[in-house]
Amino acid sequence: ARNGDHCPLGPGRCCRLHTVRASLEDLGWADWVLSPREVQVTMCIGACPSQFRAANMHAQIKTSLHRLKPDTVPAPCCVPASYNPMVLIQKTDTGVSLQTYDDLLAKDCHCI
Amino acid sequence: ARNGDHCPLGPGRCCRLHTVRASLEDLGWADWVLSPREVQVTMCIGACPSQFRAANMHAQIKTSLHRLKPDTVPAPCCVPASYNPMVLIQKTDTGVSLQTYDDLLAKDCHCI
C-alpha cells in the first residue's frame, strides 16, 4: 500500500525540500556571476522508502525490484519534481545582463 | 569542465540504462495484470560523478555542493530523462482491457 507523504523513518528523514546556503565560490560561479553573492539553494534530500512520494509507475517498479535485488537495483532517489525560477546578474562579453534560470532551485520533491 | 558521457570510473560504472527481467510476481502485479507474464524493465542505474550527464543547472549545483558538504548534500542521482510507453493487459471491474502506461520503462538516463 502507498504511504504517500508519511515517512516511516521518522520526521524529516524522508525525501523533502532542504535549503542549503551557498556562496558564489562554493558554486564555482565567482568568475561569471555578480549577484547574488549567496544563494539559498533549495534541493531534494532524504530517503525514499517503499512508495514514499513515488513519482510514477517506474518508481513503484524500482521499489519492488530494489526489495528483491538490493545489490542490483537501487532504491528510488529523491529528486526535484518541479523548479522555481531564479535570476542571476552575470558578466557577459558585452557587459552585465540579467538571466533567468528555470532549472536551478527545486520547488518540490518526489522519489524516482 | 563537463565530461558529458565519459565515465571516469570505468566502462559501464556510470549512470546508464540497464535491463532487469521481472515477473508479475516480482512487481506485485499478479493480481491485476494478465499480460505480459514477464517484463524487461529498463531502468537507470549507475554513479553520477562530477558533471557526468548532468541534467541541468541544479545537477551542476548539487555536484559542487556535494564536493563541499558530502555528509549534507548527496551526489546527483541517476534517473530517467525520458520514458518508453508500454501496454499492460489488465483486469478491471468491467472485464479485461488494454492500458498504455507512459511512465513505466526508462528510455534514457541523466544525473540530477
Epitope: - | 494478465l34 499480460s35 505480459p36 507474464r37 510507453p85 508500454m86 501496454v87 499492460l88 488494454l98 498504455t100
Partner: antibody
Framework: QVTLKESGPGILQPSQTLSLTCSFS??????????VGWIRQPSGKGLEWLAH???????YYNTALKSRLTISKDTSNNQVFLKIASVDTADTATYYC??????????WGQGTTLTVSS | DIVMTQAAFSNPVTLGTSASISCRSS???????????LYWYLQKPGQSPQLLIY???NLVSGVPDRFSSSGSGTDFTLRISRVEAEDVGVYYC?????????FGAGTKLELK
C-alpha cells in the same frame, strides 16, 4: 480510438506479388508489447494467421507460407506492410490486419478483398 | 500446428434462452504458468472478428456479461445466458499457446 484499415490491389493474376498496407491510428508501434498481425479469410471459410511484427521489429511468419511472406513496418507513419510472392487462386481471400498486445488481439480492420484470377 | 475443432452450426436457439458453443483443441492449451491460452471471437455478418474472451475465462471489457467461458485443457465451452438478436454470427475459438495462432472453423449461431 483505435482504427486499422487495409489496402491492396483487389485483383491480381497468378504469379504476381501481393502488396498489402495496414494504416492505423490510435496506437503506436513503438510501444512495448504492441504488434500488428495479418490474418486472412477465404470467402465463407475460417481464419488463417499469416504473420505479425512487434514493436521491437521481431517478426513471425506462418511456417507453411514463410518462403512467400515479407512483413515490415514504418513506425513513424503508422503503417505495416505485407508482401506475398507468387500468388495463386488459393490466395483469394479477405485480408485483415489486427492490433496485438502480447496475445491480446483486440482491434481488426474491416478487411481488403483479393481475387486471384487469370 | 494445433488444430481447433468446432461444429459448423449450433443448435438453433430462441431469443432470451441460453446457448452453448463448443471447441476442442488437439493439444492441451494449459501452460505450466497456469494460464489457458484459449480465446473466443465473434464475427457478425459483414464485420471483422471481435475479441470476446481472453485466456479462456476473462471477459473483455465492453462485452456483455451474458457471455461466459469455461473449459479444461482441451475442451471448451462458450455460454450465452440470454441470447439477443445482436449475438447472431460466427463464433471462433482460437489458441495462442503455440505459433502460429490457430482458429477453429467457426460455429454459426442460428436462431429458431
Amino acid at each position: 480510438q483505435v482504427t486499422l484499415k487495409e489496402s491492396g490491389p483487389g485483383i491480381l493474376q497468378p504469379s504476381q506479388t501481393l502488396s498489402l498496407t495496414c494504416s492505423f491510428s490510435g496506437f503506436s508501434l513503438s510501444t512495448y508489447g504492441i504488434g500488428v498481425g495479418w490474418i486472412r479469410q477465404p470467402s465463407g471459410k475460417g481464419l488463417e494467421w499469416l504473420a505479425h511484427i512487434w514493436w521491437n521489429d521481431n517478426k513471425y511468419y506462418n511456417t507453411a507460407l514463410k518462403s512467400r511472406l515479407t512483413i515490415s513496418k514504418d513506425t513513424s507513419n503508422n503503417q505495416v506492410f505485407l508482401k506475398i510472392a507468387s500468388v495463386d487462386t488459393a490466395d483469394t481471400a479477405t485480408y485483415y490486419c489486427a492490433r496485438l498486445a502480447y496475445d491480446y488481439v483486440d482491434s481488426w480492420g474491416q478487411g481488403t478483398t483479393l481475387t486471384v484470377s487469370s | 500446428d494445433i488444430v481447433m475443432t468446432q461444429a459448423a452450426f449450433s443448435n438453433p436457439v430462441t431469443l432470451g434462452t441460453s446457448a452453448s458453443i463448443s471447441c476442442r483443441s488437439s493439444k492441451s492449451l494449459l501452460h505450466s504458468n497456469g494460464i489457458t491460452y484459449l480465446y473466443w471471437y465473434l464475427q457478425k455478418p459483414g464485420q471483422s472478428p471481435q475479441l470476446l474472451i481472453y485466456q479462456m475465462s476473462n471477459l473483455v471489457s465492453g462485452v456483455p456479461d451474458r457471455f461466459s467461458s469455461s473449459g479444461s485443457g482441451t475442451d471448451f465451452t462458450l455460454r450465452i445466458s440470454r441470447v439477443e438478436a445482436e449475438d447472431v454470427g460466427v463464433y471462433y475459438c482460437a489458441q495462442n499457446l503455440e505459433l502460429p495462432p490457430t482458429f477453429g472453423a467457426g460455429t454459426k449461431l442460428e436462431l429458431k
